[in-house]
């Protein structure tokens, strides 16, 4: 599998409509929780929780502050921590508790605490529960949590130093935790947790299961340096611990290695960064997408692997276990266990088969089973990705977070659209197209190029958004910027399953998965732009320049995958020649203008899509070079003298749509100053005229004409 190509389009922060939320002096907007039924996004930041309108996050609905007392700050600072940064309250757990309350935990100046947030009054109830084991002490330490039926399952560190890792369930009737032992958890970096509900139709009447994802130091391999291993672990919701062995500890904790590597090379991605569980009505089994980087990542590599949940459960239900060995001078501490496995199977959830054998709860399990799972929490079998290879490998980028949306294109094909954020504040949108990856676009979410810490996807039909949290704020972006594709060709070449061209309105429209009719829309995920209707009108710009001056002819082509070249009177121009230059890789500069430079200039783009090359005329300019007698200015051009010898003209430019009235491109005012009109929103093939005013006195006027479509190809 080759590395993913560069994103086809790059949207700068200012180019697209992004909604932002941030409050002065509030940082670390790293906890996001979406309430779809209330259209509310809850944001946990440093010392504050906000509720904002999920459809427009700039609209703040509520806020509540949870600050650390000066006394606590001082005590924290005495222990060697920074009063300005570490000794504050970073919100780390933001989970739904009921329809009217949230469960919130914060680092609380290295004394983690939890409270209930009443959503009606938007005030904390002041419970001030001990957050130990639910929330890290140190804001720099890893953590994950999920609320399951009113009980919090967490993965974090249990002490001030962060040296004791724990996966626990906070429950009034049955609190459970992992053993503090290296075979169970070895310096883990927690990434994600989620619950997978039992299938009601399974013939085994099994339990709900909670999955944890983390990277830890390997116990299987011991080299000169520490080898990191990505893990998937799971516990059963019905686990109540053992009666004697594993009392108040998990009896169902099992973990396995996640494999994400490139089979044809030595590339192994062993540091887990984020996980997203994709659930969709069309999916028989949930799929989880995992984001990885290699351990030694000096080249900026990232990969995404997708896994069927059933593959992981198969490993836990039927796989072999690992056992520690005491072989001297061996790199491998742990080997496959081939001995007899006690019944009921160690680590298995209590199902109908176990119940039929009178094991109605984990408290009834025999000591042999419990002792075995205590000593063998690690599976020998690994969890392998779908198709045994990554979905995406990208060079020169460090991905941070991932969310995935399953959507249907016009032809009925289903695509898993991956939204992946970077450590430089960007968001990549990618799909798999016939065993190749197509990065549809890159959007710069954060102007300051800061890492995206959290990504969240709304699943409500109609208004769909991606929310991204960073140190400085939260950004809301639509799933697609269809309207930015100005022509049918651009819309089709985008190969965006959310977008289709609407010939009646001549716009690229978003295909919201609603019941609205899709008849007549054009979408071709192969990128075959020949399906686009012929343009009835092609426009060109007419320019008048003064002899000896320099002209810049604009060509706005957004595609990073396209090569732009210029034709003059149907011959291809060599931009490297002394006569011509390229500005910004696209705009044509013509130096030392003479009458011989008059004529038709065309900017064309050439883009490889699959095995086809698609050519587009992006812009067409008709240039006329005039020799102007020194003192005379033709009155018909309504030329206004400005600042000595510089000359400007009143220029009319017709709209490229051909329907709206002409708008002035450059307006010479009565005062003699030049005022530019408001710049139209740029589109994929916008072609604004440009006036170049040189030290050489120069005349440049322009207008837009129309050619028949046959001249436009």
């Amino acid at each position: 599998m080759a590395f993913a190509p560069i994103p086809r389009i790059t949207w700068e922060h200012r180019e697209v409509h992004l909604v932002q939320f941030h409050e002065p002096d509030i940082y670390n907007y790293s906890a996001l929780l979406l309430s779809e039924d209330k259209d509310t996004l809850y944001i946990g930041a440093r010392e504050a929780v906000f509720a904002v309108n999920a459809l427009n996050i700039s609209e703040k609905q509520h806020e509540v502050y949870w600050k650390v007392s000066e006394d606590k700050k001082a005590k924290c600072a005495e222990k060697g921590k920074s009063k300005q940064t570490e000794c504050l309250n970073y919100i780390r757990v933001l989970q739904p508790l009921s329809a009217t309350s949230l469960y919130v935990c914060g680092t609380n100046a290295f004394q983690p605490a939890c409270d209930h947030l009443n959503l009606t009054s938007f005030k904390f109830l002041g419970k001030n529960e001990d957050g130990k084991g639910r929330c890290p002490f140190d804001p720099a330490h890893s953590y994950t949590s999920v609320m399951v039926d009113g009980e919090l399952y967490s993965g974090t560190s249990y002490n001030f130093l962060g040296s004791e890792p724990i996966i626990s369930r906070n429950s009034s009737h049955s609190p459970l935790r992992t053993e503090y032992a290296i075979p169970w958890l070895n310096e883990p970096s927690f990434v994600f947790a989620d619950v997978i509900r039992k299938s009601p139709d399974s013939p085994d009447g099994e339990d709900d299961r909670v999955y944890f994802f983390f990277t830890e130091v390997s116990v299987e391999y011991e080299f000169v340096f520490r080898v990191l291993i990505p893990r998937i672990a799971r516990v059963c919701k019905g686990d109540q611990g053992g009666l004697r062995t594993l009392q108040k500890k998990w009896t169902s904790f099992l973990k396995a290695r996640l494999i994400c590597s490139r089979p044809d090379s030595g590339l192994v991605f062993n540091v887990l960064r984020d996980v997203f569980v994709l659930r969709s009505p069309g999916l028989k089994v949930p799929v989880f997408y995992a984001l990885f980087t290699p351990q030694l990542n000096n080249v900026g590599l990232s990969a995404v692997c997708a896994y069927n949940l059933s593959t992981a459960e198969e490993v836990f239900s039927h796989g072999k276990y690992m056992q520690s060995t005491t072989v001297e001078q061996s790199h491998t501490k742990w080997v496959r266990y081939n001995g007899p496995v006690p019944k009921p199977r160690p680590g298995a959830c209590i199902d109908s088969e176990a119940r039929a054998a009178n094991y109605t709860s984990s408290l009834n399990l025999p000591d042999k089973t419990l002792q075995f799972v205590k000593d063998h929490p690690l599976m020998d079998d690994s969890v392998t990705p779908i198709d045994n290879r990554p979905r995406l490998i990208k060079k020169d980028v460090n991905y941070t977070q991932i969310v995935v949306d399953r959507t249907q294109a016009l032809d009925g094909t289903v695509y898993d659209v991956m939204f992946v954020s970077t450590d430089r504040g960007a968001l990549h949108k990618a799909i798999s197209l016939e065993h190749a990856v197509h990065i549809i676009e890159e959007t710069q979410l954060f102007q300051d190029f800061e890492p995206v810490q959290t990504l969240l996807l709304s699943s409500k039909k109609g208004n769909r958004f991606v929310y991204a949290g960073s140190n400085s704020g939260v950004v809301q972006a639509p799933l697609a910027f269809c309207g930015k594709h100005g022509t049918c060709e651009d819309c089709v070449l985008a190969r965006d399953p959310y977008c289709a061209w609407s010939p009646p309105t001549a716009t690229c429209v978003a295909l919201h998965q609603t019941e609205s009719p899709s008849r007549g829309l054009i979408q071709e995920m192969s990128g075959d732009a020949s399906v686009c209707p012929d343009k009835s009108k092609g426009s060109y710009r007419q320019h008048f320049f003064k002899h000896g001056g320099t002209a810049e002819l604009k060509c706005s082509q957004k595609s990073n995958l396209a090569r732009v070249f210029w034709k003059f009177q149907n011959g291809v121009l060599k931009a490297e020649s002394p006569k011509y230059g390229l500005m910004g890789r696209k705009n044509l500069l013509i130096f030392n203008l003479s009458e011989g430079d008059s004529g038709v200039y065309q900017c064309l783009s050439e883009e490889r899509v699959k095995n086809k090359t698609v050519f587009q005329v992006v812009a067409k300019h008709v240039l006329e070079v005039k020799v102007v007698p020194k003192p005379v200015v033709a009155p018909t051009l309504s030329v206004v003298q400005t600042e000595g010898s510089r000359i400007a003209t009143k220029v009319l430019v017709a709209s490229t749509q051909g329907s709206s009235p002409p708008t002035p491109a450059v307006q010479a005012t009565s005062s003699g100053a030049i005022t530019l009109p408001p710049k139209p929103a740029p589109t994929g093939t916008s072609c604004e005229p440009k006036i170049v005013i040189n030290t050489v006195p120069q005349l440049h006027s322009e207008k837009t004409m129309y050619l028949k479509s046959s001249d436009n190809r």
Epitope: D204, K284, E313, S352
Partner: antibody
Framework: EVKLVESGGGLVQPGGSLSLSCAAS????????MSWVRQPPGKALEWLGF??????????ECSASVKGRFTISRDNSQNILYLQMNALRAEDSATYYC????????????WGQGTSVTVSS | DVLMTQTPLSLPVSLGDQASISCRSS???????????LEWYLQKPGQSPKLLIY???NRFSGVPDRFSGSGSGTDFTLKINRVEAEDLGVYYC?????????FGGGTKLEIK
Amino acid sequence: EVKLVESGGGLVQPGGSLSLSCAASGFTFTDYYMSWVRQPPGKALEWLGFIRNKANGYTTECSASVKGRFTISRDNSQNILYLQMNALRAEDSATYYCATYGRLGYTMDYWGQGTSVTVSS
Amino acid sequence: DVLMTQTPLSLPVSLGDQASISCRSSQSIVHSNGNTYLEWYLQKPGQSPKLLIYKVSNRFSGVPDRFSGSGSGTDFTLKINRVEAEDLGVYYCFQGSHVPWTFGGGTKLEIK
């Protein structure tokens, strides 16, 4: 002893309706999913659908071939499973079986003897 | 829907021989809980089907140990060691992992 007895089969005209019953005994009826399976003469078995147990709200699943025409229901006080068949077609002619859906790792562990339905003008 | 394809359609054997029936699913029938609900049923002439094997390789109670099931993912096999007269009939594979549940087309085991 688990016993399932189907009844209600017979000859019906295309477009007509028929209701099949399955009387169950020997087990706690409300604890079990119940399935319907049919077999056209000389052909393979075809799963039609099931009705879930009490714990899962007695909701149903049906195969696409009968969805919208056939309805599965149950009378838990009488321990009877029903299959209401409407808009019958010639291709619905078959022997219809009811079966219990076991919860020990297997699906249809006990079957009735079947009842024959013929759709013909 | 998951399509179950059985081969052969008909299997003539001599009593005492070993018989092998294959079943292939159009997609993985591993349930989200990690189990594979692949079952084998035997239907004798004029009778209702009887469960033989569940979860790929587990024999149902009362089923003789000459019946064995194997396979994983999408490929499954039923083997009958030393075929006896009472084993004759039509064998069906069935998947109960993904709704709608589906049967194979059947394999008729008959005397050569």
